[in-house]
C-alpha cells in the first residue's frame, strides 16, 4: 500500500498545535484511503528545508527568499503548491516589486546614483533585497558592508530598521530610521509617503501600494514606474515594468520522490473542507494562537504549481539575480557597457557541433549551451543559463509567453536592403505525392501524416489549427491513422512513423531523422501520405539539391500541394495554394540581453553571413546541408524588427489568435508553467 501521509513541517509550538488540529480535522473528513497529515516539529525554516531534503519531512510553506534557499544544493527542493490571494476568479499568487517615481522627475533606472531613495525597511523583499540586489553591481566598491555602499550610492535615504549611528545617510530622510509604524515612512505605505511628500526621488514598494494609497486615477497619473530597460511606464503597467515578480508564499517539496501529487491532493481537499468560509471548527487560513501559522492568514486558497516549473523559473530571473548578487556578492570584472559573450542555445549534438564551430570562429563573442528540446532551451534562456536562439513562430509564441522578446528576424529573400526589411513571412503548405491523386484537404482522415514537430508553425500550429476548427477536438492522433510529429507522447500513433532509434524516436531534435522541414518531407517520401512543411521545402530537397541518398533522385514534379478549397496544385503555385502565411523564424532573448544580442549578431552575420561565398573554406552561419541547424539554411540575413519588438507584434494578431485557439490542445508543459506566472 503506498504511503499516503504528508509529513508537514512546523517551526514553533503554535504551528505544531495548528498542525495537529489540521491532522485531526483532515482525518474526520477524508476517507481512510485518502491523504493524511503527520506533523514534524523543527526549530527553524532552514531546519525544515534540511529535513525535507533528508526525507524526514515532506512539505513546508515558505516566503520567496526561503524558496531560493530551499532550491540551492544540496537541498534541491521545488515549489509544488502556491497560496493565492484575492478572489478565486482572479487569483493572485505573485506580487511585483516596483520602483515608483514622480512623473516629471526625468531620470531612468540607470541614473539612480545620487538620487534620494525610500525603502520599506532594511532586509525586506520589495523595499530592499530586490532593488539593492539588482543595483548591486552598480554600487561603489567596496560593497561590504552593504549599508555603507548603498549610503554612498544614493545621496540620502530612508531605510527603516537600519543602524542610524553607523549609517546616518540611510536615515537622512526619516530621522532615527524607526522600525515600526511610529516611523511615518516605514513599510509599503510609508515608503510611498516618503516619495509623495517629496523627501525621496524613488520609492521601492510593491505594485499594489500605489493603488492602496491613491484611490483616484488622476492622482496615480502623477507617478510612473522605472523599468529595467531604462524606460518608464504608467503605474498600471506593472506587469511589463517591474524589478521582479515575487511569489507570495509557497509549499515546497523534494524534486525527486517529493510526493507533489499527494501534497496537492491533500491541500486541495483541505481547502474544500477548511478553506475560506468553509468551516467554523477549523480554518486553514486562520491563526487563533498567533499569525500566519502554516499558511498566511490572508490566503484565499491554493493553486497547483505546474510540474515543469522549478524554483528558478518560479522565482524568475530578476528575483534570482537580485538574491544571488546579495548572497554571493560577485560582479563581472568587465565594464557593464561592454557586451559579454552571447550564450547560444543549441539543440542536441548536431546543432552543438555547428555552434562550437561558430564559437571558435567568433573569437570570444559566442559561447554554446546545449539542451535536448526547444522548450528546454527557452527555459535556459529564461533563467540565464543561455541567452539566445532562433525559433520557429510557434516557439516565438511560447518564448513570448515566458517573457522573452524577439530581437532579429530571419529573412529568406535576397534584396538590396535585407537587414532593414523584415519580410511578411513564408507559406505553410500541405504536400502529397502526385501519384496519390485522390487525396485532398477534405479526405485526410485516416491518412499518414508527417509534421516538422509539435508546436511548430507550418508543421503543426497552422494545419492542426485548421483541422481543429473542422473536427472540434484535440484527438489528432485519432484523426490520422499514424504519423510522425516529433514531440508527441511516445505511445501516440503520431510517433509510429518516426525513424529515430531507441530513446531518440520522435524526439523534437535532429536525432530524429523525420524532425524539421527536411525530416517531415523525408517522412512523406518514405512512409507518409501528407507532409506539413514550408513552401521552399520541396524545391530545396529535389532536383539533386539535397545530396543525401534518400533525396538525391527526387523530382519536384512528383509532388503536389493540397489547397483548402479541396483542389490540388503544382508545388510552384504555393502563392495560390497554401494553408496560411507563417511568420519568419526569429531570434529571441531576455529583455536585459536585447541590445547585446542585436549588436553581436549583426557583427557575426557581417563576418559569416550569406556574403561568404565559399563555405567549404570558411565558416558559414546559415549553412548546414539542408539540416537547418541554428538557423534555417535558406536564411539570407537577420533583419531588424523596427517596432515589431514584442512577440504579439512580431507574430501578428491573426497568428497569435490561431495559436491561442490551439492552446486547449497544447501539450506544452513550459507554456503551462509560464502562463501560471503570467495568466
Amino acid at each position: 500500500v503506498p504511503d499516503k501521509t504528508v509529513r508537514w513541517c512546523a517551526v514553533s509550538e503554535h504551528e505544531a498545535t495548528k498542525c495537529q488540529s489540521f491532522r485531526d480535522h483532515m482525518k474526520s473528513v477524508i476517507p481512510s484511503d485518502g491523504p493524511s497529515v503527520a506533523c514534524v516539529k523543527k526549530a527553524s525554516y532552514l531546519d525544515c528545508i534540511r529535513a525535507i531534503a533528508a526525507n524526514e519531512a515532506d512539505a513546508v510553506t515558505l516566503d520567496a527568499g526561503l524558496v531560493y534557499d530551499a532550491y540551492l544544493a544540496p537541498n534541491n527542493l521545488k515549489p509544488v503548491v502556491a497560496e493565492f490571494y484575492g478572489s478565486k476568479e482572479d487569483p493572485q499568487t505573485f506580487y511585483y516589486a516596483v520602483a515608483v517615481v514622480k512623473k516629471d522627475s526625468g531620470f531612468q533606472m540607470n541614473q539612480l546614483r545620487g538620487k534620494k531613495s525610500c525603502h520599506t525597511g532594511l532586509g525586506r523583499s520589495a523595499g530592499w533585497n530586490i532593488p539593492i540586489g539588482l543595483l548591486y553591481c552598480d554600487l561603489p566598491e567596496p560593497r561590504k558592508p552593504l549599508e555603507k555602499a548603498v549610503a554612498n550610492f544614493f545621496s540620502g535615504s530612508c531605510a527603516p530598521c537600519a543602524d542610524g549611528t553607523d549609517f546616518p545617510q540611510l536615515c537622512q530622510l526619516c530621522p532615527g530610521c524607526g522600525c515600526s509604524t511610529l516611523n511615518q515612512y516605514f513599510g509599503y505605505s510609508g515608503a510611498f509617503k516618503c516619495l509623495k511628500d517629496g523627501a525621496g526621488d524613488v520609492a521601492f514598494v510593491k505594485h499594489s501600494t500605489i493603488f492602496e494609497n491613491l484611490a483616484n486615477k488622476a492622482d496615480r497619473d502623477q507617478y510612473e514606474l522605472l523599468c529595467l530597460d531604462n524606460t518608464r511606464k504608467p503605474v498600471d503597467e506593472y506587469k511589463d515594468c517591474h524589478l521582479a515578480q515575487v511569489p507570495s508564499h509557497t509549499v515546497v517539496a523534494r524534486s525527486m520522490g517529493g510526493k507533489e501529487d499527494l501534497i496537492w491532493e491533500l491541500l486541495n481537499q483541505a481547502q474544500e473542507h477548511f478553506g475560506k468560509d468553509k468551516s467554523k471548527e477549523f480554518q486553514l487560513f486562520s491563526s487563533p494562537h498567533g499569525k500566519d501559522l502554516l499558511f498566511k492568514d490572508s490566503a484565499h486558497g491554493f493553486l497547483k504549481v505546474p510540474p515543469r516549473m522549478d524554483a528558478k523559473m518560479y522565482l524568475g530571473y530578476e528575483y534570482v539575480t537580485a538574491i544571488r548578487n546579495l548572497r554571493e556578492g560577485t560582479c563581472p570584472e568587465a565594464p557593464t557597457d561592454e557586451c559579454k559573450p552571447v550564450k547560444w542555445c543549441a539543440l542536441s549534438h548536431h546543432e552543438r557541433l555547428k555552434c562550437d564551430e561558430w564559437s571558435v570562429n567568433s573569437v570570444g563573442k559566442i559561447e554554446c549551451v546545449s539542451a535536448e528540446t526547444t522548450e528546454d532551451c527557452i527555459a535556459k534562456i529564461m533563467n540565464g543559463e543561455a541567452d539566445a536562439m532562433s525559433l520557429d513562430g510557434g516557439f516565438v509564441y511560447i518564448a513570448g509567453k515566458c517573457g522573452l522578446v524577439p530581437v532579429l528576424a530571419e529573412n529568406y529573400n535576397k534584396s538590396d536592403n535585407c537587414e532593414d526589411t523584415p519580410e511578411a513571412g513564408y507559406f505553410a503548405i500541405a504536400v502529397v505525392k502526385k501519384s496519390a491523386s485522390d487525396l485532398t484537404w477534405d479526405n485526410l482522415k485516416g491518412k499518414k501524416s508527417c509534421h516538422t514537430a509539435v508546436g511548430r508553425t507550418a508543421g503543426w500550429n497552422i494545419p492542426m489549427g485548421l483541422l481543429y476548427n473542422k473536427i472540434n477536438h484535440c484527438r489528432f492522433d485519432e484523426f490520422f491513422s499514424e504519423g510522425c510529429a516529433p514531440g508527441s507522447k511516445k505511445d501516440s500513433s503520431l510517433c509510429k512513423l518516426c525513424m529515430g532509434s531507441g530513446l531518440n524516436l520522435c524526439e523534437p531534435n535532429n536525432k530524429e531523422g523525420y524532425y524539421g522541414y527536411t525530416g517531415a518531407f523525408r517522412c512523406l517520401v518514405e512512409k507518409g501520405d501528407v507532409a506539413f512543411v514550408k513552401h521552399q521545402t520541396v524545391p530545396q530537397n529535389t532536383g539533386g539539391k539535397n545530396p543525401d541518398p534518400w533525396a538525391k533522385n527526387l523530382n519536384e514534379k512528383d509532388y503536389e500541394l493540397l489547397c483548402l478549397d479541396g483542389t490540388r496544385k503544382p508545388v510552384e503555385e504555393y502563392a495560390n495554394c497554401h494553408l496560411a502565411r507563417a511568420p519568419n523564424h526569429a531570434v529571441v532573448t531576455r529583455k536585459d540581453k536585447e541590445a547585446c544580442v542585436h549588436k553581436i549578431l549583426r557583427q557575426q552575420q557581417h563576418l559569416f553571413g550569406s556574403n561568404v561565398t565559399d563555405c567549404s573554406g570558411n565558416f558559414c552561419l546559415f549553412r548546414s546541408e539542408t539540416k537547418d541547424l541554428l538557423f534555417r539554411d535558406d536564411t539570407v540575413c537577420l533583419a531588424k524588427l523596427h517596432d515589431r519588438n514584442t512577440y504579439e507584434k512580431y507574430l501578428g494578431e491573426e497568428y497569435v489568435k490561431a495559436v491561442g485557439n490551439l492552446r486547449k490542445c497544447s501539450t506544452s508543459s513550459l507554456l503551462e508553467a509560464c502562463t501560471f506566472r503570467r495568466p
Epitope: 555547428k354 571558435v360 565559399d614 573554406g617 565558416f619 548546414s624
Partner: nanobody, 117 residues
Framework: QVKLEESGGGLVQPGGSLRLSCAAS????????MAWYRQAPGKQRELVAG???????KYADSVKGRFTISRDNAKNTVYLQMHSLKPEDTAVYYC???????????WGQGTQVTVSS
Amino acid sequence: QVKLEESGGGLVQPGGSLRLSCAASGSIVSIATMAWYRQAPGKQRELVAGITRGGSTKYADSVKGRFTISRDNAKNTVYLQMHSLKPEDTAVYYCTDYSRTYYEDHWGQGTQVTVSS
C-alpha cells in the same frame, strides 16, 4: 572528403605532458576550422580546443593555460599540446574538421589519453 587520424595518446601521470597529432589525408589549407573534442566514459563529447584557418584559437575553460592547439598546413596536421595533465582529462580525444559532422557522425577512432598515478 579528407580523412583524419588521431595519434599520440597514452598513459601519463598527473602533472605530465602529451602531444596529440591529427594527420589529414589531404590538404587542410582551405579547411575553415579544425578542433579537438574529447569524450569521457558516460559523458557527452565536448569541445576541448579549436583553431580557425587564420590561426584564431578557442579553449574550453577547463584546459585554458594548459593546452595549446596549433595547425601545420604544410604537414596537413593539427596538434594538441597538453601540459599539467589531471585525472579529469582522461578521455578519448577526437579530431574534426567539421566538414560532415554537422549532419553525420563522421568521427575517427580517436586516441585514448589516461591520466593516472
